[in-house]
């Protein structure tokens, strides 16, 4: 009926997310009633995608409202008998249209899950489900495909026209004369044996029968329908009626008799009592998020989705939160780029997963003979003579600090430095003044001080 933001949930949003036109798809999945959601069971009872999908165009500044949904039914064919109790999963998917949509084209907006009890043949049940900020209004019902009847669609009912206790417009069933069929809404005159209808005033024919009222057998030999050629004198023989007469299995299904009834073995992609319902195949594009659709290997799985990195689920509908596994060590920030994971490391750490501690002496040597010294949560290198820098990889310039006093000239040397002193000075750093009378040298006064009477220093 409708899908949109729920009431009183903050700023209303549009399903189109203000990113231009979009389409909404609904994936309906039926699971057995005993199924636990946690055990990611398959849609064992059946699944289908909505087909009638209008384009919603959102105009900027327009207040968000629930989008009305078209009347297109989502038919979910179920196999075998109807269980009555089941889990109903409805996923609402948004396909963003337009070139400048930005972000992923497909998004799972909402997923509602709930257990239900429902007998086949009952009226439409209405429901409203809220999940997050979204609200979905929908109705659902279970119907048996003719000739199945009953709350579990487990009985086969063939209409009889004999008088019965059934009310007007209702006909009794074979082999259950006490069970009455639903009111006939088929086109008047539609063959009760070879025709059926889903909508009023229509008449659909079982395979092997044709005509507006399904009364004309399709000829496969000179003998009609299930009659077989007999001796020339007798023309055609009519064998006793059998459940597979006229082959009730559509779409190439093969019919086999089972205890007075029939069973159809359906080809891939078809389900239902008579293989009349087409199931989801790769042609329906069931794989989301760029998943590759290939054939399934079991008769009950027509397709398999091969998901791209970062997605999982039977339809690649679930984004794998690979960062939730916290692959980045030492407080690194995890970035899921889709095709790969990237870790942005904190200062002092490196490596694809920030596993290398740059502030740790373990496994990290100081170059050129330097030694690693830890302290205060950090590490530094004490470098050998002639080297410097964080890892002692830089060759030091020993003359950079002008170590030679009194105009001495500095020369870098492999073992350090050598000072060539100016006349009148001596010492490793030219720090001593030479006395002119040959007495011991005295430390020279710093430059800028006048040395009036050297002898007062003796």
């Amino acid at each position: 009926h409708s899908f949109g933001p729920g009431p009183g949930l903050g700023t209303p949003r549009s399903p189109c997310n203000a990113r231009g036109p979009c389409r909404l798809f609904f994936r309906v999945c039926l699971k057995p009633g005993v199924s636990q959601e946690a055990t990611e069971s398959l849609c064992a009872l059946g699944a289908a995608l909505s087909t009638s999908v209008p384009v919603y165009t959102e105009h900027p500044g327009e207040s968000a409202a629930a989008l009305p949904l078209p009347d297109g039914l989502v038919r979910v064919p179920f196999r075998d008998a109807w269980p009555g109790t089941f889990s109903l999963v409805i996923e609402t998917w948004r396909e963003q249209l337009g070139e400048h949509a930005g972000g992923p084209a497909w998004n799972l907006l909402a997923r509602v899950v709930g257990r239900r009890r429902l007998a086949a043949g009952g009226p439409w049940a209405r429901d409203v489900q809220r999940t997050g900020t979204w609200e979905l209004h929908f109705s659902y019902r279970a119907r048996c495909e003719p000739p199945a009847v009953g709350a579990a669609c487990a009985r086969l009912c063939r209409s009889r026209s004999a008088p019965s206790r059934c009310g007007p417009g209702l006909r009794p069933c074979t082999p259950f004369p006490d069970e009455c069929e639903a009111p006939s809404v088929c086109r008047p005159g539609c063959s009760p044996e070879h025709g059926y209808c889903e909508e009023p005033d229509e008449c659909r024919c079982l395979e092997g029968w044709t005509g507006p009222l399904c009364t004309v057998p399709v000829s496969t030999s000179s003998c009609l329908n299930s009659r077989v050629p007999g001796p020339a004198s007798t023309g055609c023989l009519l064998p006793g009626p059998g459940p597979c007469d006229g082959n009730p299995c559509a779409n190439g299904g093969s019919c086999s008799e089972t205890s007075g009834s029939f069973e159809c073995a359906c080809p891939r992609g078809f389900y239902g009592l008579r293989c009349e319902v087409s199931g989801v195949t790769c042609a329906d594009g069931p794989c989301f998020n760029g998943g590759l659709c290939v054939g399934g290997e079991d008769p009950d799985s027509a397709y398999v989705c091969h998901c791209p990195p970062g997605f999982q689920g039977s339809n690649c509908e679930k984004r794998v939160d690979r960062c939730s596994l916290q692959p980045c060590q030492n407080g690194g920030l995890c970035l899921d780029l889709g095709h790969a994971l990237r870790c942005r490391c904190r200062a002092g750490f490196a490596g694809p997963r920030c596993e290398h501690d740059l502030d740790d002496c373990a496994g990290r040597a100081c170059a050129n003979g330097g030694t690693c010294v830890e302290g205060g949560g950090s590490r530094r290198c004490s470098c050998a003579l002639g080297f410097g820098g964080r890892d002692c990889r830089e060759r030091a310039d020993p003359c950079a600090s002008r170590p030679c006093a009194h105009g001495g000239r500095c020369y870098a040397h492999f073992s350090g430095l050598v000072c060539a002193c100016a006349p009148g000075y001596m010492g490793v750093r030219c720090e001593f003044a030479v006395r002119p009378d040959g007495a011991d040298a005295v430390p020279a006064a710093p430059r800028g001080l006048r040395q009036a009477d050297p002898q007062r220093f003796l």
Epitope: L42, V294, G295, G296, D298
Partner: antibody
Framework: EVQFQQSGPELVKPGASVKISCKAS????????IHWVRQSQGKSLEWIGL????????VYNQKFKSKATLTVDNSSTSAYMELRSLSSEDSAVYFC????????WGQGSTLIVSS | DIKMTQSPSSIYAFLGERVTITCKAS??????LSWFQQKPGKSPKTLIY???RLVGGVPSRFSGSGSGQDYSLTISSLEYEDVGDYYC?????????FGGGTKLEIK
């Protein structure tokens, strides 16, 4: 009757390429995956990959991604596997198959890589 | 990749004996498992799919069971024609992977 007819044995030199064919019959070709499987002498089976003729979808075993290229020709209902940069390690019997619930296999194509 | 560990690697049994071969998956494969029989010089033949469903035309003495990670193939009464190699295959997840095989011989 469903059948897969594979091409005959091949003797090739290291570094060369070879293309093995698999002609399918007896069913709707586009309905089912065609798988390729390798069996080295005295060894187990290894899944190389599959191709889905309906849409051309291909899934490779990463181990064989740079070794094998899978293709189909729907008009002739044939599948092909090209193997490149061959070495003696690639000497094996290669099968095409439908690995589904009915399970039909080709007779196998023997490849010998030798100088 | 899912690793399939098959055991035993070889088995000798008497005619009429009950024989069981097992396969263990490295993770849950949700019963997406097939069993194959291969006779010398021949192509493999599918016996079982979806862990326990018998392929048409396969004798009913073959049966499969198991769930989750553990699966087995049982021959209820061994016959001479059952001699050969047996393989399991998981098809729950790409890449599909086979077990290492079991050689079955008559005592």
């Amino acid at each position: 009757e469903v059948q897969f007819q594979q091409s005959g044995p091949e003797l090739v030199k290291p570094g060369a390429s070879v293309k093995i064919s698999c002609k399918a019959s007896g069913y709707t070709f586009t309905d089912y995956n065609i798988h390729w499987v390798r069996q080295s002498q005295g060894k187990s089976l290894e899944w190389i990959g599959l191709i889905y003729p309906f849409n051309g979808g291909i899934v490779y075993n990463q181990k064989f991604k740079s070794k094998a290229t899978l293709t189909v020709d729907n008009s002739s209902t044939s599948a092909y596997m090209e193997l490149r940069s061959l070495s003696s390690e690639d000497s094996a019997v290669y099968f095409c198959a439908r690995l589904n619930w009915e399970g039909y296999w080709g007779q196998g194509s023997t490849l010998i890589v030798s100088s | 990749d899912i690793k399939m560990t098959q055991s035993p690697s070889s088995i000798y049994a008497f005619l009429g004996e009950r024989v069981t071969i097992t396969c263990k998956a490295s993770q849950d494969i949700n019963s997406y498992l097939s069993w194959f029989q291969q006779k010398p010089g021949k192509s493999p033949k599918t016996l079982i799919y979806r862990a326990n469903r018998l392929v048409g035309g396969v004798p009913s003495r073959f049966s499969g069971s198991g769930s989750g990670q553990d699966y087995s193939l049982t021959i209820s009464s061994l016959e001479y024609e059952d001699v050969g190699d047996y393989y399991c295959l998981q098809y729950a997840e790409f890449p599909y992977t086979f077990g290492g095989g079991t050689k079955l011989e008559i005592k």
